[in-house]
């Protein structure tokens, strides 16, 4: 029942061009190139894309034409390797061009940079943006794709087309509005925040596939789809998992045309078979393609079937437990995961995967024992502490969040994580802790039944950001250990880390704590980041500082900024009062 075309095409590039249409084809090739060559100027990429598109058109006209039978990796790789400044701009990535496919593509993939050295995107004035949009709409939208793709080299390409469509709609509507800024800015903020979240979620999918393999991704997908589609039978869920795995494997592997094409096919299949999948799909399936795919990916969980029987009968009490496990391990474990997940929309996916792993480990041991049934009879009792651990953690942290508010909750996490892994760079600690802190506003408002899936699965996404950033420049064995040992136990691994007693405190540097009048013109968010950067540095200097000491210093710092920003001669105030603050802080912390 596979939805994907198995027939061979004489020309793969012609096949994809015809399936996707010229507009999507060009957009996806641009995304692919920008995700591979993240430093190349926009104009260079547009030129390469136009050349590929013209070539694709010749193949559509005649599939037997020269080079039309080549694979997409060969065609795209050859095109990327024509870039004149490859060695100067990318260094050893240029060595990829000496390799043959498929090694060349693997080489390009390995050089994708999660934290490229690119300037922060600064939003121009609304009138400037509207003029640019009206002057050349096509270039304006291509520039958006390019800028997002190069900064987010694993962004889910078909979803980026959906973002671009919304971006275009925002400008089309708001550039005609009476108050352009009031109309446009909230929409752009929403797109930016959703885009960052989408990028991080996809990064976890790619890390799961690339670092832990297809089996790990499939297990994640079985659990999530079973929660979402609890009325669907296991065979249906398995089929969706197989197809979804293919889609994400392609996108994570840089095969963006195949990925977008197969995602469209999967959406079509789901909508044609919604009666046997979920009652919640009706509205999604009435939408155009990009909206439809996005809507399906975000669709709410269907209601659980009534009167689902206890799992114990089939998975503990049955005489055939070990026979099933021996005959088809992964199918049997998949069935267990499906049955458990459809009954527990209140559990996080990672918790469900931990339970499945515990069940697997128990069967592995017990099915080789003298009395297997006696050995595994109490396996469900082992689940209790695994369930209670995230429940308690979420309860405690939501209480702390409600007590402190988001900013101070982030600060508590900044201190906590800096003490756990002080070797990690300050920008990474600030970024990750700020995102960890957002779990409060995102999830604590939910009722009990929705808190755990919201919180723990979100934390998995954020901790993966830490893992991919740390992998680029590894500095902490503890981070490496938590990131690589088990995908589903990353969060418990980080939670269990105590203060790193081996850490040698950083030398005090007054420059780190020197501030200038420019802080006064920053947005509230940027000002918070400055203060949080200082907080991390404080902890790195004095890892044994108490909460009270740190709070006192931070309160003094906030008062200092507020005072100097109100002063007539701000710069003098920052210079003089700053010295006093540093001295007072050193005394308070015993530096």
């Amino acid at each position: 029942r596979g939805v994907f075309r198995r027939d061979a095409h004489k020309s793969e590039v012609a096949h994809r061009f015809k399936d996707l249409g010229e507009e999507n084809f060009k957009a996806l090739v641009l995304i692919a190139f920008a995700q591979y060559l993240q430093q190349c100027p926009f104009e260079d990429h547009v030129k390469l894309v136009n050349e590929v598109t013209e070539f694709a058109k010749t193949c559509v006209a005649d599939e037997s034409a020269e080079n039309c039978d080549k694979s997409l990796h060969t065609l795209f790789g050859d095109k990327l390797c024509t870039v004149a400044t490859l060695r100067e701009t990318y260094g050893e990535m240029a060595d990829c061009c000496a390799k043959q496919e498929p090694e060349r593509n693997e080489c390009f993939l390995q050089h994708k940079d999660d934290n490229p050295n690119l300037p922060r995107l600064v939003r121009p004035e609304v009138d400037v943006m509207c003029t640019a949009f009206h002057d050349n709409e096509e270039t304006f939208l291509k520039k958006y794709l390019y800028e997002i793709a190069r900064r987010h080299p694993y962004f889910y390409a078909p979803e980026l087309l959906f973002f671009a469509k919304r971006y275009k709609a925002a400008f089309t509507e708001c550039c005609q509005a009476a108050d352009k800024a009031a109309c446009l800015l909230p929409k752009l903020d929403e797109l930016r925040d959703e885009g960052k979240a989408s990028s991080a979620k996809q990064r976890l999918k790619c890390a799961s596939l690339q670092k832990f393999g297809e089996r790990a991704f499939k297990a994640w997908a079985v659990a999530r789809l079973s929660q979402r589609f609890p009325k669907a039978e296991f065979a249906e869920v398995s089929k969706l998992v197989t197809d979804l795995t293919k889609v994400h494997t392609e996108c994570c592997h840089g095969d963006l045309l195949e990925c977008a094409d197969d995602r469209a096919d999967l959406a079509k299949y789901i909508c044609e078979n919604q009666d046997s999948i979920s009652s919640k799909l009706k509205e999604c399936c009435e939408k155009p393609l990009l909206e439809k795919s996005h809507c399906i990916a975000e669709v709410e969980n269907d209601e659980m079937p009534a009167d689902l029987p206890s799992l114990a009968a089939d998975f503990v009490e049955s005489k055939d437990v070990c026979k099933n496990y021996a005959e088809a391990k992964d199918v049997f474990l998949g069935m267990f995961l499906y049955e458990y997940a459809r009954r527990h929309p209140d559990y996080s996916v990672v918790l469900l995967l931990r339970l499945a792993k515990t069940y697997e480990t128990t069967l592995e041991k017990c099915c080789a024992a003298a009395d297997p049934h006696e050995c595994y009879a109490k396996v469900f009792d082992e689940f209790k502490p695994l369930v209670e651990e995230p429940q308690n953690l979420i309860k405690q942290n939501c209480e702390l969040f409600e007590q402190l508010g988001e900013y101070k909750f982030q600060n508590a996490l900044l201190v906590r994580y800096t003490k756990k892994v002080p070797q990690v760079s300050t920008p990474t600690l600030v970024e990750v802790s700020r995102n960890l802190g957002k779990v409060g506003s995102k999830c604590c408002k939910h009722p009990e039944a929705k808190r755990m899936p919201c919180a723990e699965d979100y934390l998995s996404v954020v901790l993966n950001q830490l893992c991919v950033l740390h992998e680029k420049t590894p500095v902490s064995d503890r981070v490496t250990k938590c990131c690589t040992e088990s995908l589903v136990n990353r969060r418990p691994c980080f939670s269990a880390l105590e203060v790193d007693e081996t850490y040698v405190p950083k030398e005090f540097n007054a420059e780190t704590f020197t501030f200038h009048a420019d802080i006064c013109t920053l947005s509230e968010k940027e000002r918070q980041i400055k203060k949080q950067t200082a907080l991390v540095e404080l902890v790195k200097h004095k890892p044994k500082a108490t909460k009270e000491q740190l709070k006192a210093v931070m309160d003094d710092f906030a008062a200092f900024v507020e005072k100097c920003c109100k002063a007539d001669d701000k710069e003098t105030c920052f210079a003089e009062e700053g010295k006093k603050l540093v001295a007072a802080s050193q005394a308070a912390l015993g530096l």
Epitope: F234, A313, D320, K323, N324, E327, A328, V331, F332, M335
Partner: nanobody
Framework: QVQLNESGGGMVQAGGSLRLSCAAS????????AGWFRQAPGKEREFVAA???????TYADSVKGRFIISREYAKNTVALQMNSLKPEDTAVYYC?????????????????WGQGTQVTVSS
């Protein structure tokens, strides 16, 4: 606990067709292997066909190409479409189920059984 109830049996001329249906109650059996067995007077109960969770099917050589086993998840049923019937197909047909990934062919491996439905093929 799973209860199985067969229906659709009856008398038919050789060369004719019948469709047997097996309705499960007590729980959904889509993950279960389901099988059809038959017992002619004075003979051992024998395997006819089986289907597993992903609709992989197996058949006894004597019915291959003539009988089709299928399942419908929404209705929690398993069916046996019997075509080109022969007098030697006359028997009581039983539906059986077991929670197994790979559908067994031997009756002793099945946990749940229906009461049976009579099929008579006259020449």
């Amino acid at each position: 606990q799973v209860q199985l109830n067969e229906s659709g049996g009856g008398m038919v001329q050789a060369g004719g067709s019948l469709r047997l249906s097996c309705a499960a109650s007590g729980r959904t059996v889509s993950n279960y292997a389901a099988g059809w067995f038959r017992q002619a007077p004075g003979k051992e109960r024998e395997f006819v066909a089986a289907i597993n969770w992903n609709k992989t099917t197996t058949y006894a050589d004597s019915v291959k190409g003539r009988f089709i086993i299928s399942r419908e998840y929404a209705k929690n049923t398993v069916a046996l479409q019997m075509n080109s019937l022969k007098p030697e197909d006359t028997a009581v047909y039983y539906c059986a189920a077991v929670f197994r990934i790979v559908a067994p062919k031997t009756q002793y491996e099945y946990d749940y059984w229906g009461q049976g439905t009579q099929v008579t093929v006259s020449s």
